[in-house]
């Protein structure tokens, strides 16, 4: 008894096609081994016609394929343009030779039933409608008009002009005449199914003077479109169902062994497996819509169907479109964490991959929202201003050429938890999904800025310090000035990191920023952060308000993206050799973007270097103080 299973008998008609599904036991070996379809000869030998290794015999060239569906433990042999010569005994099987596990299938291809010479052929897709034209002579104008469907013995009424309708056609069949033309009647049948296919006769009048016309209606199932996508990439199903279903609810479902399970529909249903990574977008009034799925997984491979019906569920006799999605595990898209965890008040730095060949593409970050059909409003982008509600706490750092850009979100709250997408205006396959989880903070943040309520006085000197733990001793520290176009890193240099010492004083690891003299444009958000090369780490944010000496606090306003930056170590002597041009905030440079700035850092303010007990968070003993430039207005 073979563990392979399939149809024992298959019968079809010349010119038609068959799709033979063979089922195999669920084992890893079976999923990966060769699948074949062979024809049995009189000698008992079985000659391969097609196999999953890519072999295709001459007689099947251009008219057959074999597709393995490992997720369903099936493989399918599709054969088109059948002829009577295809009648015979076959085997579908598994194994390196045709003597492996197999199942016997008998295929019988019959001649097309002879159609009367005046037969009119209508070819329609499943779910669509057909209008059959039935001409008649004037003398039969007052007589009964009818359409019947031929069965083996008789012709079964579909509809007639006395409003008699076969139960199978109620609500689907209409008999009508157009205008004043009394020589033709029409029958429209909607929501066509496979079962409507066949021979029909339309008739006007009775007896020998009756007008008759033969009609052959062919109802075709849509051929699945094959889609090949990489693991972790995205796929868009473009569904075009036609104007007649423009106002119906739309759905995308995935066929499993038993049914077609709805993944998403326009009535708000969504499969939890696709949470955070799916959108359905109505395109226009012509019944067109698309479904986008990001972060493709191995288990997403399979047979998908889109359709339209008021229930938002698959319904026979309604138009559909189908796809076979293959997910290639050898992906060009790097394997990144799909879940990022943060704590309230803290920050996250999310590395977004993009196609390295498209380094000049525009980069975006959006938040997936599941309400309605799902949407992903852009929160930040290389040429998109940060959304107002994210003021001061969201920035995108582009790192041209290395295939990654970074999005930093700080001042986290539990409401920030959810799904976010990385996307560009280039290669759409590189859309990726990140789930952000935010837990309640249980300890102090790693980076702390003092003073916390920062109000600078116009014209005076103002210093803020960013305290960091010893575990960050080897990382680059930076300050940047936030604007709704990004966070422009201010020229800075951490002198302490290059010094040899035997201790790391937890209390005195700091990088400071001095504004001297304070101007109105200095008001706004500033970030203190750490990074290692192109990898960004934690950040913290502070809003610096600027007020006049004689007045109370001024209104909090975001500042100009090109505000001049002045950064200094506390009480560091002024180095006025840096020109204003060099000190403009450069869009997204590294902390050491300007060689001149590194060279101009002196070895001053020795007294600020910390020395204390040995020991640090990461087992290194090192003292570091930060030296920075300070610029005069």
């Amino acid at each position: 008894k073979s563990p392979i299973f399939g149809p024992q008998e298959v019968s079809s008609i010349e010119g038609d096609s068959v799709s033979i599904t063979c089922y195999y036991p669920d084992t890893s070996v079976n999923r990966h081994t060769r699948k074949y379809w062979c024809r049995q000869g009189a000698s008992g030998m079985c000659t391969t016609l097609i196999s999953s290794n890519g072999y295709l015999s001459k007689e099947y060239s251009g008219r057959a394929n074999l597709i393995n569906f490992p997720e369903n433990n099936t493989f399918v042999i599709n054969i088109e343009q059948l002829t009577q010569d295809d009648t015979g005994s076959y085997k579908c099987g598994l194994g390196t030779s045709n003597r492996g596990l197999s199942f016997d299938v008998s295929l019988e291809v019959s001649q097309v039933p002879e159609l009367p010479s005046d037969t009119h052929v209508y070819t329609k897709d499943i779910g669509r409608n057909v209008t059959i034209e039935c001409p008649f002579k004037r003398e039969n104008a007052p007589s009964k008009k009818s359409l019947c469907k031929k069965t083996n013995q008789s012709c079964e009424l579909v509809i007639d002009s006395t409003e008699k309708v076969n139960p199978s056609y109620i609500g689907r069949a209409k008999l009508f005449m157009k205008g004043t033309d009394l020589t033709v009647f029409y029958v429209n049948i909607s929501h066509l199914t496979h079962n409507d296919a066949g021979l029909y006769i339309c008739q006007a009048g009775e007896g020998p003077s009756a007008d008759k016309k033969n009609v052959d209606l062919q109802v075709l199932a849509p051929e699945p479109e094959l889609l090949y996508k990489d693991l972790r990439s995205s796929v868009t199903f473009e569904c075009d169902l036609g104007r007649e279903v423009a106002n119906e609810a739309k759905y995308l479902c995935r066929m499993n062994k038993e049914t077609c399970d709805v993944i998403i529909n326009t009535l708000g249903k969504r499969d939890p497996d696709f949470e955070g990574r799916i959108l359905i977008t109505p395109k226009d009034d012509n019944g067109r819509f698309s479904v986008l799925i990001t972060g493709l997984r191995k288990e997403d491979a399979g047979h998908y169907q889109c359709g339209a019906h008021s229930s938002g569920l698959p319904q026979e006799g309604w138009p559909i479109q189908t796809w076979q999605l293959f997910v290639n595990e050898e992906s060009t898209i790097p394997n990144r964490r799909s879940v990022v965890k943060g704590v309230t008040g803290g920050s996250v730095a999310i590395a977004c991959p993009y196609n390295p060949k498209e380094s000049s593409s525009l980069k975006y970050w959006c938040r997936w929202e599941g309400d309605g059909n799902g949407h992903c409003p852009v929160l930040v982008g290389t040429q998109a201003q940060v959304q107002e509600e994210y003021e001061g706490r969201l920035a995108l750092f582009d790192q041209p050429g290395n295939g990654t850009y970074t999005v930093i979100l700080n001042q986290l709250t539990t409401e920030d938890a959810g799904f976010y997408w990385c996307l560009t205006n280039g290669d759409s396959r590189w859309r990726t999904t990140i789930e952000l989880q935010v837990a309640e903070a249980t300890r102090e943040p790693n980076l702390e800025v003092t003073p916390q309520n920062a109000t600078a006085v116009l014209g005076e000197t103002f210093t803020v310090s960013c305290h960091y733990p010893c575990k960050f001793y080897s990382q680059e520290k930076y300050w940047c000035k936030w604007s709704n176009k990004g966070c422009h890193i201010l020229p800075s240099h951490d002198e302490g990191a290059r010094q040899s010492s035997v201790s790391c004083d937890q209390s005195s690891q700091l990088v400071s920023m001095t504004l001297n003299p304070v101007s109105k444009e200095d008001e706004g958000w500033y970030w203190c952060g750490v990074k290692q090369g192109q990898t960004y780490g934690e950040t913290t944010a502070i809003y610096i308000a600027v007020e006049e000496r004689t007045r109370g606090s001024s209104h909090v306003n975001p500042t100009d993206a090109n505000a001049r930056a002045k950064v200094a170590l506390e009480e560091e002597v002024v180095d006025s050799s840096i020109s204003e041009k060099e000190n403009k905030a450069i869009p997204n440079p590294g902390p050491f973007a300007n060689e001149r700035e590194i060279q101009n850092v002196g070895d001053q303010a020795q007294e600020n270097r910390a020395s204390g007990d040995a020991g640090s968070a990461d087992g290194q003993s090192r003292s570091s103080s930060s030296k920075h430039h300070h610029h005069h207005h």
Partner: nanobody, 127 residues
């Protein structure tokens, strides 16, 4: 209301023949797959035979235990299903159920591949 009604069951001698029929009414579609299952006392429901229609092609499936003895046939448009049983054996004794599904996919041997079920008809084969 959807109804699948089986008929033709009865008591026969071993090696006799019997023909079961199933008529569907109230189905919102002409089925694309219909099948026969059976359940003997104290046993699981098991697949017997099925027929599937797609376009002008027909696909027939049989359980190993009935191959060569049972023949399934049906009319997709009329929503009828027949099972011609020959050379019956005592182990064929069971309640035979008719099942239908609007779609032509899913493993026909699994009961989950069918949406609608009949009440069953008893077949008893005495030795």
């Amino acid at each position: 209301e959807v109804q699948l009604v089986e008929s033709g069951g009865g008591v026969v001698q071993a090696e006799d023949s019997l023909r079961l029929s199933c008529a569907a009414s109230g189905l919102p579609f002409s089925s694309s797959r219909m099948g026969w299952f059976r359940q003997a006392p104290g046993k699981e429901r098991e697949f017997v035979a099925a027929i599937g229609w797609s376009g002008r092609s027909t696909y027939k499936y049989y359980a190993d235990s009935v191959k060569g003895r049972f023949t399934v046939s049906g009319d997709n448009a009329k929503k009828t299903l027949d099972l011609q049983m020959k050379d019956l054996k005592p182990e064929d004794t069971a309640v035979y159920y008719c099942a239908a599904h609007p779609d032509y996919y899913g493993d026909p041997r699994t009961s989950g591949a069918y949406r609608y079920w009949g009440q069953g008809t008893q077949v008893t084969v005495s030795s």
